[in-house]
């Protein structure tokens, strides 16, 4: 790291070190030999989240309902607004600027992890012994029916998309 002329939380201007403005405040005027750095608080709809020498505060993010967004956490003078997606939708990126509907898991696949406001549904193929016959964003793979516990026999084998079909035992078998 190259050497710096000033302390932490200071900046160099006109060959002297001035204090940075604290988070939540913007720079009005640099310090002089006789005066401190002058800072002003950000307005209600603005923020600055670091020690800074910015002359303008940043606008809080707008969570646009037309894009499926809603406020998860209201911004302060030191923090930006955090948006999340309405139910049934998730963010398209880490910055959550728009939302898309959750993916449904097709027949033969079950839900491994249910979607959240920030992550999509995670599907997994139904393993042997399990099936899913619906397209769903919630349903996990279900186990095949156990014919034996019902004193029935398998008449039709199950697949990853269908349950087994049970039927009565063949009377002619001893």
């Amino acid at each position: 790291e190259p050497p710096t002329a000033c302390r932490e939380k200071q900046y160099l201007i006109n060959s002297q070190c001035c204090s940075l403005c604290q988070p939540g405040q913007k720079l009005v005027s640099d310090c002089t030999e006789f005066t401190e750095t002058e800072c002003l608080p950000c307005s209600e709809s603005e923020f600055l989240d670091t020690w800074n020498r910015e002359t303008r505060c940043h606008q809080h993010k707008y969570c646009d309902p037309n894009l499926g967004l809603q406020v998860q956490q209201k911004g302060t003078s030191e923090t930006d607004t955090i948006c999340t997606c309405e139910e049934g939708l998730h963010c398209t990126s880490e910055s959550c600027e728009s939302c898309v509907p959750h993916r449904s898991c097709l027949p033969g696949f079950g839900v491994k992890q249910i979607a959240t406001g920030v992550s999509d549904t995670i599907c997994e193929p139904c393993p042997v012994g399990f099936f899913s016959n619906v397209s769903s964003a919630f349903e996990k793979c279900r186990p095949w029916t156990s014919c034996e516990t019902k004193d029935l026999v398998v008449q039709q084998a199950g697949t990853n998309k269908t349950d087994v079909v049970c039927g009565p035992q063949d009377r002619q078998r001893a």
Epitope: P3, E8, L12, S15
Partner: antibody, heavy 126, light 107 residues
């Protein structure tokens, strides 16, 4: 009362490294920058750099960049200065020195040293 | 880097004399200057900071003045314990730099 107690004298060969410690007591260690200053025999004072014990942030004089490392252990209120690739002209007394707490410092870095360690003589000789 | 030039490099004086040491910065440093006293085998001792503020416990015969580039340390009446080397130091920006020192010797 404020005290800075440094480790003992060291004799090193050229190319070796030395690590000097500085144990602080009598004040909040994380509240004041710690600086390192050296003095070659019969010479003046030379500033090496500082460490902010609170954040661990450092700032080294260009001359020592890449050769010096300043660290701290806040659990034992101790600052360390390690100098690598020693040369004969690194023979000097090395001091740790505490920033004077100037509450009204509006500009400037305001680094004045109100407390010093007793000094550690590092001799570099083959 | 800001160069600090002290003069004289040495001065011979007697007890009771008024001694003046000057320090010049290669660029303006406002009032961000300190003066230290160092005795052989000892660490430096802060006398004055912000060019003219006397450090707690330092005798009032020591005074400092100046701003910008030119500064002065004055010992109004030299005492036996004042024979030592004196250094100025700028505290405007890093890297901190010291003057070359002024040795005050017994005449």
């Amino acid at each position: 009362q404020v005290q800075l107690v440094q480790s003992g004298a060291e004799v090193k060969k050229p190319g070796a490294s030395v690590k000097v410690s500085c144990k602080a007591s009598g004040y909040t260690f994380t509240g004041k920058y710690m600086h390192w200053v050296r003095q070659a025999p019969g010479q003046g004072l030379e500033w090496m750099g500082w460490i902010n014990p609170d954040s661990g942030g450092t700032n080294y004089a260009q001359k020592f960049q890449g050769r010096v490392t300043m660290t701290r252990d806040t659990s034992i209120s101790t600052a360390y200065m390690e100098l690598n690739r020693l040369r004969s002209d690194d023979t000097a007394v090395y001091y740790c020195a505490r920033d004077q707490p100037l509450g009204y410092c509006t500009n400037g870095v305001c680094s004045y040293f109100d407390y010093w360690g007793q000094g550690t003589l590092v001799t570099v000789s083959s | 880097d800001i160069q600090m030039t002290q003069s004289p490099s040495s001065v011979s004086a007697s007890v009771g004399d008024r001694v003046t040491i000057t320090c010049r910065a290669s660029q303006g440093i406002y009032s961000w200057l300190a003066w230290y006293q160092q005795k052989p085998g000892k660490a430096p001792n802060l006398l004055i900071y912000t060019a003219s503020t006397l450090q707690s416990g330092v005798p009032s015969r020591f005074s400092g003045s100046g701003s910008g580039t030119d500064f002065t340390l004055t010992i109004s009446s030299l005492q036996p314990e004042d024979f030592a080397t004196y250094y100025c130091q700028q505290a405007n920006i890093f890297p901190l730099t010291f003057g070359g020192g002024t040795k005050v010797e017994i005449k």
